[in-house]
Interface confidence: low
């Protein structure tokens, strides 16, 4: 089943996806596509990285994080209702059938006419910009409260950096929990 993320019309949507490079600079190709992950590759590719750089992207789709550290989370700018649907993040690990595939469901809600002040925010809103470090050093595993039981070693970030990050504050404010270690 897909993990669900929400954003409002006109906002930027954030779809998290991470892996841990074997060493800084040892990047793995990644593709993002609209639609569930097929057997191979990504369908309707909106962004792609190779072993060195982001080599293909389309309007409104970009990587806000540090893809060199394995943060290949997708940002979709200024979303509309048409952006709703399943997105595939495919980490193209060398070898036969080694790819890591993540299907993420994006739900776009109509914009509120009169937004009421609140500290309770969507999971997506709690991640306006994921922590982006060049992130060198030991990677630790983190568990995000609203993620399912998937292999988080593959999608880890530097938890020691997270301890003091704005992301941790956002998570705390939003009611989501983060367990480090």
């Amino acid at each position: 089943s897909e993990v669900e993320y929400r954003a409002e019309v006109g906002q930027n949507a954030y779809l998290p996806c991470f892996y841990t490079p074997a060493a800084p600079g040892n990047l793995v190709p990644v593709c993002w596509g609209k639609g569930a992950c097929p057997v191979f590759e990504c369908g309707n590719v909106v962004l792609r990285t190779d072993e060195r750089d982001v080599n293909y992207w389309t309007s409104r789709y970009w990587l806000n994080g540090d893809f060199r550290k394995g943060d290949v989370s997708l940002t979709i700018e200024n979303v509309t209702l048409a952006d709703s649907g399943i997105y595939c993040c495919r980490i193209q690990i060398p070898g036969i059938m080694n790819d890591e595939k993540f299907n993420l469901k994006l739900v776009i809600k109509p914009a509120k006419v009169t937004p009421a002040p609140t500290r309770q925010r969507d999971f997506t809103a709690a991640f306006p910009r994921m922590l982006t470090t060049r992130g060198h050093g030991p990677a630790e595993t983190q568990t995000l409260g609203s993620l399912p039981d998937i292999n988080l070693t593959q999608i880890s970030t530097l938890a020691n950096e997270l301890r003091d990050s704005r992301l941790a504050n956002d998570l705390r404010d939003s009611g989501a929990t983060i367990r480090i270690g």
């Epitope: 800084p24 600079g25 040892n26 060195r52 060199r68 910009r129 982006t132 470090t133 704005r166």
Partner: antibody
Framework: QVQLQESGPGLVKPSETLSLTCTVS????????WNWIRQPPGKGLEWIGY???????NYNSSLKSRVTISVDTSKNQFSLKLSSVTAADTAVYYC???????????WGQGTTVTVSS | EIVLTQSPGTLSLSPGERATLSCRAS???????LAWYQQKPGQAPRLLIY???SRATGIPDRFSGSGSGTDFTLTISRLEPEDFAVYYC?????????FGGGTKVEIK
């Protein structure tokens, strides 16, 4: 054409805090890394640290306890604060853009900071 | 920390000659993240080469970079008068980002 301009006092007293600002013009501060580098007189380049516009930072461990780099996206600026300065912190301070893959492709012209009483 | 050692410290050559500058790393550097910069007196450094071998925008093709792992080279095929300057290598693949000590290319 993106340009960077450093600004701040050219003279700082020992034990005080050095404060510099880098203004980004001709482009957005978004989606890149923004670095501070310094060069003592007659010496080589030393990386101080960088900030991503999201606010994430990475500092040179040798200076980490004294350095703070911050960003103000609304003003298209990022800043350096270096506390408890000594004469050894006298240098030309540069700000530079780093796209992540392409290296530091745009630099400010540098500003000289002298630490002296 | 990756220490970058540049050699020679000073290179004395005449215009038209070939310059070969070396940068050696204390541990392996991903070639994707090795850059070369040129700095003239009173000026900021200028990016010449990124990714060990790719020329930055506007850099003449007499400048070329090569190497991988721990050994990298900047070659200036035919020195022009404006090429006499200090050259720095830099690795930006692991923290802290580090620069070499520089090689001064001076007129013989």
């Amino acid at each position: 054409q993106v340009q960077l301009q450093e600004s701040g006092p050219g003279l700082v007293k020992p034990s005080e805090t050095l404060s510099l600002t880098c203004t980004v013009s001709g482009g957005s501060i978004s989606r890149h890394y923004w670095n501070w580098i310094r060069q003592p007189p007659g010496k080589g380049l030393e990386w101080i640290g960088y900030i991503h516009y999201s606010g994430s930072t990475n500092y040179n461990s040798s200076l980490k306890s004294r350095v703070t780099i911050s960003v103000d996206t609304s003003k298209n600026q990022f800043s350096l604060k270096l506390s408890s300065v000594t004469a050894a912190d006298t240098a030309v301070y540069y700000c530079a853009r780093d796209t992540g893959y392409y290296g530091m492709d745009i630099w400010g012209q540098g500003t000289t900071v002298t630490v002296s009483s | 920390e990756i220490v970058l050692t540049q050699s020679p410290g000073t290179l004395s050559l005449s215009p038209g000659e070939r310059a070969t500058l070396s940068c050696r790393a204390s541990q392996s550097v991903s070639s994707s993240y090795l850059a070369w910069y040129q700095q003239k007196p009173g000026q900021a450094p200028r990016l010449l080469i990124y990714g060990a071998s790719s020329r930055a925008t506007g850099i003449p093709d007499r400048f070329s970079g090569s190497g991988s792992g721990t050994d990298f080279t900047l070659t200036i095929s035919r020195l022009e008068p404006e090429d006499f300057a200090v050259y720095y290598c830099q690795q930006y693949g692991s923290s802290p980002l580090t620069f070499g000590g520089g090689t001064k290319v001076e007129i013989k």
